[in-house]
Interface confidence: low
C-alpha cells in the first residue's frame, strides 16, 4: 500500500503479512497486506485490528477490527463506545456510509481515526497529537511501526521511478515479484492518467499513487481509495500547506 | 513483555523473607511505585495483554486503598499532560482528563497534530 | 506454588447445567486472565473461552455463545464456568488455565481438570 | 474440524529428532506471533511446552523448540527421550480467534 508517515514522507510499500502501523502507550494498530495479485510485489490492506487500550476512567480496553466486506461500525465486543466508564463517550465510533466509511473518535487521546473500504481493500488515515504518537516507553527497542518510522528499505518500491518507464512495460516489471502476473483488464497509460485525472487534477504523489494502482492492477477502485485518501488528508491534516506532497522522500525509513 | 517479571518483583518486595513491607507501611507504597514504574518501562511491548493491563489496574486500586501518594522517590517524570496509560491517578468526578484538548489547553495553547494514512497499492 | 484446583466430577442428564469451580492460588488472581478449555474422549483440546479477573470481561467461543458463563469471585480467587442445556457431546474434561501474558496469547498453569459426564 | 492441521503421528528413537507440523491459514498462523505448544500425557492436564512461537518457559528442558516459517509453525524435540511420548498441540491466537489443532502423538520407538 501507499504510506504517508507522521513525518508526511510517502512511500509505497510491499509489507505483506501483519504490520504494526501504530504502537504507543494508549493505542495499537495494525495491517495485515494481501498481494494485489498472484506473483505481485504490490500489496493492499485486507484487514485492520486497533487496539485502544484501557485509560484510567475513561475507556477500557476496546478493539476494533475490519476486513474485506466487513467494515463494523462497532467494536468486537459490540459496544460502539469506551465501556461503562465515567468518561466512556470519550471514545466513540459513528458509521458516516453502511460497510463503506467508519470514523473512530478517540478525545481522550486527541485523535480521530477514518477506516474505509474502497473495493476489495482497506484504507487508514489518522489525526493524532505529536504527544500522543511520541508516548512511547523504549525507543531504543522500538521496532519497525510504518506510521512512525516508514517501510524498511527493502520493502519500498520506488513507483516514481516507475512512471518515467510507465507507458513502456515499467508498470508490470515494478509490481511483479516472480514472472508478470496478468492483470485483468490493465489499462494503457494514457487512460489510466485520463481517469485518475478526472478525481485527482493535482498531479501530486496521490495522483501518480492513482495511477501506478491503476497500470498495477487494472482495478479501477483504486482511484477512488486515492481520491478519498486525500479527501481524509485535507480533513486530518493540520497544515493546509501540505496537503499535497509532490516528492517522495528517499531518506531511510527512521 | 516483561510484567510477569514486574509482578515478582512486586511479590518480593512485598512477601519476600527479609522484612517484608506489610500493607500499612511507607515501603509498600514504594513498592507499588516500583511496581507502576515497572509496568510503565514495560508498557510499549506489553501492548493488549491482560496480564499487563490487570497489573496497572491492580496497582490503580491498591495505590488508593492504602492511601499512596503517586509521586515519590521512584517514580518516573510523566508527560505534561497526559499520565502513562492506566497510570494511578486520583479519581476524579469530571470527565476532563477524557478529553485531551480541554486538559492540553490547561498547559498551552494547541496541540501540535500530526497525521497517517494508508491506502491503495 | 501457582495452582489451580477444579472442582470434583459432574453427572449430569442432557438439558441440565453445570457450573465447575477452580480455585487460584500462590498468585495475584486480578493480574492474569483465565481460559477454558475442554476434552471430550480421546479427542483433542477445544477453546470454550476467557475471563478477565479484575474486569469481568469475557470472550466465548462462537459456538458456544449463548450457552457458556464465565464468572469470577475476587474475594476467594475463584473462576466459574457454567454450561448450560447439555448435551451428550458436552461430555468431556473441563479445564480452566491462567492466561500467561495476555488474552489467548498462552496458557502458562492448568487445573487439574473436572470430568463432566452428560447421560439420560 | 480443526483448523490448525498437525500430522496424527510422528516417531522417533530415543537420540533423536522429531518434528512436528501445525499449518493454518495466513491469518491464524501466518500473521500470528502468538502461537504455543502444550504436552499432554494420557490423564494429565496439558503443559505449556513453547509460546510466542519460540519461547521457552522455565523448567522446559532445551531440547523443545519452535519456529515458524510461512502458514507452518513447527514444534523440535532434538534428543528424544522416552518421557517426551505424549500428545502434543498448537495453539494459535490472531484477532478473536483463538485455536487448537487436532493433536499430534509423538511415540518414542
Known amino acids: 500500500p501507499h504510506l504517508r508517515t507522521f513525518t508526511d514522507r510517502f512511500q509505497t510499500c510491499k509489507v505483506q503479512g501483519a504490520w504494526p502501523l501504530i504502537d504507543n502507550n494508549y493505542l495499537n494498530v495494525q495491517v495485515t497486506n494481501t498481494p494485489v495479485l498472484p506473483g505481485s510485489a504490490a500489496t493492499a490492506t485486507s484487514k485492520l485490528t486497533i487496539i485502544f487500550k484501557n485509560f484510567q476512567e475513561c475507556v477500557d480496553q476496546k478493539v476494533y477490527q475490519a476486513e474485506m466486506d466487513e467494515l463494523p461500525a462497532a467494536f468486537v465486543d459490540g459496544s460502539k463506545n469506551g465501556g461503562d466508564k465515567h468518561g466512556a463517550n470519550s471514545l466513540k465510533i459513528t458509521e458516516k456510509v453502511s460497510g463503506q466509511h467508519v470514523e473512530i473518535q478517540a478525545k481522550y487521546i486527541g485523535t480521530t481515526i477514518v477506516v474505509r473500504q474502497v473495493g476489495r481493500y482497506l484504507t487508514f488515515a489518522v489525526r493524532m497529537p505529536e504527544e500522543v504518537v511520541n508516548a512511547v516507553e523504549d525507543w531504543d527497542s522500538q521496532g519497525l511501526y510504518l506510521c512512525l518510522r516508514g517501510c524498511p528499505l527493502n520493502q519500498q518500491i520506488d513507483f516514481q521511478a516507475f512512471h518515467t518507464n510507465a507507458e513502456g512495460t515499467g508498470a508490470r516489471r515494478l509490481a511483479a515479484a516472480s514472472p508478470a502476473p496478468t492483470a485483468p483488464e490493465t489499462f494503457p497509460y494514457e487512460t489510466a492518467v485520463a481517469k485518475c485525472k478526472e478525481k485527482l487534477p493535482v498531479e501530486d504523489l496521490y495522483y501518480q499513487a492513482c495511477v501506478f494502482d491503476l497500470l498495477t492492477t487494472g482495478d479501477v477502485n483504486f482511484t477512488l481509495a486515492a481520491y478519498y485518501a486525500l479527501e481524509d488528508v485535507k480533513m486530518l491534516h493540520s497544515n493546509k500547506d501540505k496537503l499535497h506532497l509532490y516528492e517522495r522522500t528517499r531518506d531511510l525509513p527512521g | 513483555c516483561k510484567i510477569l517479571k514486574c509482578n515478582s518483583e512486586f511479590w518480593s518486595a512485598t512477601s519476600g523473607s527479609h522484612a517484608p513491607a506489610s500493607d500499612d507501611t511507607p515501603e509498600f507504597c514504594a513498592a507499588l511505585r516500583s511496581y507502576a514504574l515497572c509496568t510503565r518501562r514495560t508498557a510499549r511491548t506489553c501492548r493488549g495483554d491482560l496480564a499487563y493491563h490487570s497489573a496497572v489496574h491492580g496497582i490503580e486500586d491498591l495505590m488508593s486503598q492504602h492511601n499512596c501518594s503517586k509521586d515519590g522517590p521512584t517514580s518516573q517524570p510523566r508527560l505534561r499532560t497526559l499520565p502513562p496509560a492506566g497510570d494511578s491517578q486520583e479519581r476524579s468526578d469530571s470527565p476532563e482528563i477524557c478529553h485531551y484538548e480541554k486538559s492540553f489547553h490547561k498547559h498551552s495553547a494547541t496541540p501540535n497534530y500530526t497525521h497517517c494514512g494508508l491506502f491503495g497499492d | 506454588e501457582v495452582q489451580l484446583v477444579q472442582s470434583g466430577a459432574e453427572v449430569k442428564k442432557p438439558g441440565a447445567s453445570v457450573k465447575v469451580s477452580c480455585k487460584a492460588s500462590?498468585?495475584?488472581?486480578?493480574?492474569?486472565?483465565i481460559s477454558w478449555v475442554r476434552q471430550a474422549p480421546g479427542q483433542g483440546l477445544d477453546w470454550m473461552g476467557w475471563?478477565?479477573?479484575?474486569?469481568?470481561?469475557?470472550n466465548y467461543a462462537q459456538k458456544l455463545q449463548g450457552r457458556v458463563t464465565m464468572t469470577t469471585d475476587t474475594s476467594t480467587s475463584t473462576a466459574y464456568m457454567e454450561l448450560s442445556s447439555l448435551r451428550s457431546e458436552d461430555t468431556a474434561v473441563y479445564y480452566c488455565?491462567?492466561?500467561?501474558?495476555?488474552?489467548?496469547?498462552?496458557?502458562?498453569?492448568w487445573g487439574q481438570g473436572t470430568l463432566v459426564t452428560v447421560s439420560s | 474440524q480443526s483448523a490448525l492441521t498437525q500430522p496424527r503421528s510422528v516417531s522417533g528413537s530415543p537420540g533423536q529428532s522429531v518434528t512436528i507440523s501445525c499449518t493454518g491459514t495466513?491469518?491464524?498462523?501466518?500473521?500470528?506471533?502468538?502461537v504455543s505448544w502444550y504436552q499432554q500425557h494420557p490423564g494429565k492436564a496439558p503443559k505449556l511446552m513453547l509460546y510466542?512461537?519460540?519461547k521457552r518457559p522455565s523448567g522446559v528442558p532445551d531440547r523443545f523448540s519452535g519456529s515458524k516459517s510461512g502458514n507452518t509453525a513447527s514444534l523440535t524435540i532434538s534428543g528424544l527421550q522416552a518421557e517426551d511420548e505424549a500428545d502434543y498441540y498448537c495453539?494459535?491466537?490472531?484477532?478473536?480467534?483463538?485455536?487448537f489443532g487436532g493433536g499430534t502423538k509423538v511415540t518414542v520407538l
Open positions: 488455565a491462567r492466561v500467561g501474558s495476555g488474552p489467548y496469547y498462552y496458557m502458562d498453569v
Open positions: 500462590g498468585y495475584t488472581f486480578t493480574s492474569h486472565g
Open positions: 475471563i478477565s479477573p479484575y474486569s469481568g470481561n469475557t
Open positions: 495466513s491469518s491464524s498462523v501466518g500473521d500470528s506471533i502468538y
Open positions: 510466542d512461537v519460540t
Open positions: 495453539h494459535s491466537y490472531a484477532g478473536t480467534d483463538t485455536l
